[in-house]
């Protein structure tokens, strides 16, 4: 059975837009009016992954591009990258546990905590125009509140 | 407070059509998914469709493609079914519910239901 | 079509009475399955997600289950409970639902 997937954006808690930055990369800034095209469009699944009270497992893939945000270990440290997947196999219900993020909703503030390193989050720094990053502390200086906006299929 | 709440009853002439509205209040109407289930008398529980106001994203049960339209007013809070070419056997109580956009909550709210009856 | 089969289809109990009615789902469905139940007016939900208790719902409630196997459980039957209950599986189109089981009063 195909996975459920929805079309979303995510702004950050100080509303900076997620845009492309080079072909396998995310950052974070301000955008206005017609830039506000500019920002990507995730099509988030809903997949399966371990039981949790608050936490629901889902993937972010980049709408219509076969690319994925993924969770990895580089020189011995999480970090978020875009992955790029075959498309005939993507999104399934079973994803690898790298492209699983638990998504954590309160007051419809999200965090998205990486399933493969748990308490590392998808992260922003405070700074305009920095990658997106997978951060291992939250309530500090890095921001992992994002909000969340429906967009057409 | 939190409710979801349907139009009147209805009898309708076979070959027509009928359309009942599903008013929501007290809830963030765009983030949950608006579920179209019937139960005919004596009989189980069929879902028709579902749609999510904030995206516009609709998914239909086949059985019923092309008989049944829903539709979302965000202006209103209000959601609606449509079904066409209707039979006798479309007599049913048509309810609506809500599901979180995320599915997690499964149906967490009922509306009070809405009896069409099909009958020449 | 995932079929969604439910047992027993009704029961007799007293108030104060354990009761536990299971569903059986052709696949499996992960942890999208709730519990609901029917009076005359509108359905009430009881269990999401197999096991979480809606707010409001007695904690006499309870659900449990993985996979194809799902049970709702009534620890302490009290008069309210008489009614109907259904399952219903949301993981794949079309949504399905159990049969029902009705409870009534011994």
């Known amino acids: 059975a195909p996975v459920r997937s929805l079309n979303c954006t995510l702004r950050d808690s100080q509303q900076k837009s997620l845009v492309m930055s080079g072909p396998y990369e995310l950052k974070a800034l301000h955008l206005q009016g017609q830039d506000m095209e500019q920002q990507v469009v995730f099509s988030m699944s809903f997949v399966q992954g371990e039981e949790s009270n608050d936490k629901i497992p889902v993937a972010l893939g980049l709408k219509e591009k076969n690319l994925y945000l993924s969770c990895v270990l580089k020189d011995d440290k999480p970090t978020l990258q875009l992955e790029s997947v075959d498309p005939k196999n993507y999104p399934k219900k079973k994803m690898e546990k790298r492209f699983v993020f638990n998504k954590i909703e309160i007051n419809n503030k999200l965090e998205f905590e990486s399933a493969q390193f748990p308490n590392w989050y998808i992260s922003t720094s405070q700074a305009e125009n920095m990658p997106v990053f997978l951060g291992g502390t939250k309530g500090g200086q890095d921001i992992t509140d994002f909000t969340m906006q429906f967009v057409s299929s | 407070q939190v409710q979801l709440v349907q139009s009147g009853a209805e009898v309708k002439k076979p070959g027509s059509s009928v359309k009942v509205s599903c008013k929501a209040s007290?809830?963030?109407?765009?983030?949950?998914?608006i579920e179209w289930v019937r139960q005919a008398p004596g009989q189980g529980l069929e879902w028709m469709g579902e749609?999510?106001?904030?995206?516009?994203?609709?998914n239909y049960n086949e059985k019923f493609k092309g008989r049944v339209t829903i539709t979302a007013d965000k202006s209103t809070s209000t959601a609606y079914m449509e079904l066409s070419s209707l039979r006798s056997e479309d007599t049913a109580v048509y309810y609506c519910?809500?599901?979180?956009?995320?599915?997690?909550?499964?149906?967490?709210?009922w509306g009070q239901g809405t009896l069409v009856t099909v009958s020449s | 079509d995932i079929q969604m089969t439910q047992s027993p289809s009704s029961l007799s109990a007293s108030v104060g009475d354990r009761v536990t009615i299971t569903c059986k789902a052709s696949?499996?469905?992960?942890?999208?399955l709730s519990w609901f139940q029917q009076k005359p007016k509108a359905p009430k939900s009881l269990i999401y997600r197999?096991?979480r208790l809606v707010d409001g719902v007695p904690s006499r409630f309870s659900g449990s289950g993985s996979g194809t196997d799902f049970t709702l459980t009534i620890s302490s039957l009290q008069p309210e409970d008489f009614a109907t209950y259904y399952c219903?599986?949301?993981?794949?189109?079309?949504?399905?639902f159990g049969g029902g089981t009705k409870v009534e009063i011994k």
């Open positions: 749609i999510l106001p904030g995206s516009g994203d609709i």
């Open positions: 696949q499996d469905i992960d942890r999208f």
């Open positions: 519910a809500r599901m979180y956009y995320d599915y997690d909550q499964g149906f967490s709210l």
């Open positions: 197999v096991k």
């Open positions: 219903v599986q949301y993981d794949e189109f079309p949504y399905t």
């Open positions: 007290g809830y963030t109407f765009d983030r949950y998914w």
